[in-house]
Amino acid sequence: REPTVQCGSETGPSPEWMLQHDLIPGDLRDLRVEPVTTSVATGDYSILMNVSWVLRADASIRLLKATKICVTGKSNFQSYSCVRCNYTEAFQTQTRPSGGKWTFSYIGFPVELNTVYFIGAHNIPNANMNEDGPSMSVNFTSPGCLDHIMKYKKKCVKAGSLWDPNITACKKNEETVEVNFTTTPLGNRYMALIQHSTIIGFSQVFEPHQKKQTRASVVIPVTGDSEGATVQLTPYFPTCGSDCIRHKGTVVLCPQTGVPFPLDNNKSKPGGWLP
């Protein structure tokens, strides 16, 4: 039978660490991490790490009992957890009978939005106390709410990841810019900024009809040339406060009729939050 892995939490040091080993198995040949999605009962889905590792192909694989994987996450707070993956059989061959290196994976470490993770792995038996054993580590940064997978998470949807304000902005005259955008039921307060290297105008927008999606219009006084300036629309939603996903547009000249000119190159940009 071919070896498989059985993984379980192991927060403290491995028992083997306390034992003296004449020789330890070789190091890992490769360690990789990628996010995978799994649906959860609430109708939302969670993002987990798929940690995969490749064993070095030589006779030292015969000593191998387990591989331990530890993950440290750094965002607003620091997290740390480890799993120990035991091999169910002794290795009879240095490579898989079907060809290729022995490769295993563990899916289980949860991934939070926009977090830097440090993933380390080492084989067991590991080095003796006061000795450095072979290990591998990789970094993995989870994406934020603009990611094509993450944007459908409930937390991101509440932060406006699926909202397209379809911003249009045009220069009415030397002193004013008209900004139009589609509101969202997620919130009723918005800030519109006009920037041309510096902020040349801004306005708070309060939209009382929060339950409906309507087209809001605001005329903003400006203190400099506004043609080609950037409009940044910052929403204020309950879940993300002032750090919600921001959207951008560009100021063009208003048509003679005074109707704002629609834009094709609207871009979205996360604020400082990126949940």
């Epitope: 004449d22 020789l23 070789g26 192909a57 030589d58 006779a59 030292s60 015969r62 000593l63 009879q92 061959t93 240095q94 490579t95 898989r96 009978p97 079907s98 060809g99 290729g100 290196k101």
Partner: antibody
């Protein structure tokens, strides 16, 4: 039945290169590492290196690292060993060898005599 | 690299004799050792692997023992076809090295 059949004897001048082939049959080529071992006349056996046909990972004996190139063609289940900048002391029989478990060599090619002479 | 010291380098024996060849390694190889027999003009033939396991089709008069750094190949009753050169080899991770060989000649 596992078989490793090597290319024929070669006579080369110093400074030239030689490429020896090892055609395999009777097993799944990508499943086992292929090793190369040489034996100078009247001398012992010397391991040169090995290649994993699955992904072409190579591990060399440092002595040969700068002059030997190991390759495979999985479509015809054949391994190759090329030795460059030949010297007279490279005159030897070159063997390919493999095994299904770890690197004890259960299966050997018949050997290829490479003579380096001016 | 692991050094392999094989002894004796040659020996003379008669048919029916018990022959012992030893192989010492420069570090513990945890029984990851193979023995080969080679006849003139032929490729080596695997006799034993993992220090004690017989290769396919190898007669039971061949046996291996040892652990750590000291290993032994024994031919319990030498036969005419056993006159050849014998090599040990470790496979405890590359680079693999062979012993210098023991030539078994007819007395």
């Amino acid at each position: 039945e596992v078989q490793l059949v090597q290319s024929g004897a070669e006579v080369k001048k110093p400074g030239a290169s030689v490429k020896v082939s090892c055609k395999t049959s009777g097993y799944t080529f990508i499943s086992y590492w292929m090793n190369w071992v040489r034996q100078a006349p009247g001398q012992g056996l010397e391991w040169m290196g090995r290649i994993d046909p699955y992904d072409s990972e190579i591990q060399y004996n440092q002595k040969f690292k700068d002059r030997v190139t190991l390759t495979v063609d999985t479509s015809i289940s054949t391994a190759y060993m090329e030795l460059s900048r030949l010297r007279s002391d490279d005159t030897a029989v070159y063997y390919c060898a493999t095994s299904g478990g770890f690197d004890w060599f259960a299966y050997w090619g018949q050997g290829t005599l490479v003579t380096v002479s001016s | 690299d692991i050094q392999m010291t094989q002894s004796p380098s040659s020996l003379s024996a008669s048919v029916g004799d018990r022959v012992t060849i030893t192989c010492r390694t420069s570090e513990n190889i945890y029984s990851n050792l193979a023995w080969y027999q080679q006849k003139p003009g032929k490729a080596p033939k695997l006799l034993l692997y993992d220090a004690t396991n017989l290769g396919d089709g190898v007669p039971s008069r061949f046996s291996g023992s040892g652990s750590g750094t000291d290993y032994t190949l024994t031919i319990s009753s030498l036969q005419p076809e056993d006159f050849a050169t014998y090599y040990c080899q470790h496979f405890w991770g590359p680079p693999y090295t062979f012993g210098g060989g023991t030539k078994v000649e007819i007395k």
